[in-house]
């Protein structure tokens, strides 16, 4: 078996972590964000060829059934594995608060 | 904002459970799964468009993202958001074996 | 290098006023948040409030809201912490400590300022 | 009476292995994160850990980090005798955002 993060098509060509640098009004928050204005979003973007970085059994069956029925079934989708936790001072009807998000920027990727 | 179960581009072009029938031999088990012969694989296929089925934050932020950067970012993807236990029998040196795999066949799905 | 610099240790009276300060260094000042934390003596950390630099927010801890006020002046990179009428009960080690890219942990601290009240 | 409980003390010698409990709920370490600091005498705290498990640059792969329901552990392997010090588990708790166990004294015996 191909080692799973090796990626086939070239480096940096595969599922992995980027960072795409973000402004409030990119994200949409800036009616409801005062901080921080700026974020590093780091997400999981990249091709998910054969054997690489596959999450789970179900990944593993979904290649070969694309590979079978490319028209019906698409490949593996390049996914966050788990995330970084993230806080942000958010405006409220009183003033500001602090709420602490656990979904917002993935920490490693995976296909599925 | 939208219903996040509304398919804005027509019924059943959006991310949702589909059912493809696949034998041993589709999906690269026949030198290990006795049975069963055919299994009805559950997965999720189709769209992400904008707000439908967003599993977290996370899902918002690379819609806002794709539309500004389409060509850097992708949109979000359809994977499963929970998988349906499943039993095999499969060869083992000494004979046979059950075994359950707990993340063969997706249950529901959802856009990341 | 990332550097925090407090201003040095400080005797009060009760019901005096007191402001301490935290510079920071190495780093883009408006970029990262920075807190507070209190240690009485012989005892643990307790997180008092925070400040975005940049937009000078401030959050306080339940405890201590009212109680001290924070502020920032970015020209100069410093944060600030403030007492308009100390107590006995203030006397403690009073930590600045820069907030990580996620806002979530203290990646840099300050090396602490001790305020002593007492009659 | 802190939100997230450490015990008081623990001791090893050098060489040992020593694990530091953190316990919270299910408002705090449960859904969220865990930080550890160490704060050797007569000085501030420095990071040890963030996010569950993760090290910063210079500190040794002695020190690891885990979670496990509304648990959180760190574990030092190799005990040495600067390892002595103030360990303090931090997360966050809705109410009164971010919070501190109490604070665990680590003696390296001998």
């Known amino acids: 078996a191909r080692n799973g993060d090796r990626c086939p098509l070239g480096p940096g060509r595969c599922c992995r972590l980027h960072t795409v640098h973000a402004s409030l009004e990119d994200l949409g928050w800036a009616d409801w964000v005062l901080s921080p204005r700026e974020v590093q979003v780091t997400m999981c973007i990249g091709a998910c060829p054969s054997q690489f970085r596959e999450a789970n059994m179900h990944a593993q069956i979904k290649m070969n059934l694309h590979r079978l029925k490319p028209d019906t079934v698409p490949a593996p989708c390049c996914v966050p594995a788990s995330y970084n936790p993230m806080v942000l001072i958010q405006k409220t009807d009183t003033g500001v608060s602090l709420q602490t998000y656990d979904d917002l920027l993935a920490k490693d990727c995976h296909c599925v | 904002a939208r219903n996040g179960d509304r398919c804005p581009l027509g019924p059943g072009r959006c991310c949702r459970l589909h059912t493809v029938h696949a034998s041993l031999e589709d999906l690269g088990w026949a030198d290990w799964v006795l049975s069963p012969r055919e299994v009805q694989v559950t997965m999720c296929i189709g769209a992400c468009p904008s707000q439908f089925r967003e599993a977290n934050m996370h899902a918002q932020i690379k819609m806002n993202l794709h539309r500004l950067k389409p060509d850097t970012v992708p949109a979000p993807c359809c994977v499963p958001a929970s998988y349906n236990p499943m039993v095999l029998i499969q060869k083992t040196d000494t004979g046979v074996s059950l075994q359950t795999y707990d993340d063969l066949l997706a249950k529901d799905c959802h856009c990341v | 290098e990332v550097q925090l610099v407090q201003s040095g240790a400080e005797v009060k009276k009760p019901g005096e006023s007191l402001k301490i300060s935290c510079k920071g260094s190495g780093y883009s000042f408006t970029s990262y948040w920075i807190g507070w934390v209190r240690q009485m003596p012989g005892k643990g950390l307790e997180w008092m409030g925070v400040?975005?630099?940049?937009?000078?927010?401030?959050i306080y801890s339940p405890s201590f809201q009212g109680q001290v006020t924070i502020s920032a002046d970015k020209s100069i990179s410093t944060a600030y912490l403030q007492w308009s009428s100390l107590k006995a009960s203030d006397t403690a080690m009073y930590y600045c400590?820069?907030?990580?890219?996620?806002?979530?942990?203290?990646?840099?601290w300050g090396q602490g300022t001790l305020v002593t009240v007492s009659s | 009476q802190s939100v997230l409980t450490q015990p008081p003390s623990v001791s090893g010698a050098p060489g040992q292995r020593v694990t530091i409990s953190c316990s919270g709920s299910s408002s705090n370490i449960g859904v969220l994160y865990v930080n550890w600091y160490q704060q050797l005498p007569g000085t501030a705290p420095k990071l040890l850990i963030y996010?569950?498990?993760n090290r910063p640059s210079g500190v040794p792969d002695r020190f690891s980090g885990s979670k496990s329901g509304t648990s959180a552990s760190l574990a030092i392997t190799g005990l040495q005798a600067e390892d002595e010090a103030d360990y303090y588990c931090?997360?966050?708790?809705?109410?009164?955002?971010?919070?501190f166990g109490g604070g665990t004294k680590l003696t390296v015996l001998g």
């Open positions: 400590a820069r907030y990580g890219r996620y806002g979530t942990y203290f990646d840099y």
């Open positions: 400040i975005d630099p940049g937009g000078s927010y401030t």
């Open positions: 996010s569950n498990d």
């Open positions: 931090q997360s966050w708790d809705s109410s009164s955002n971010y919070v």
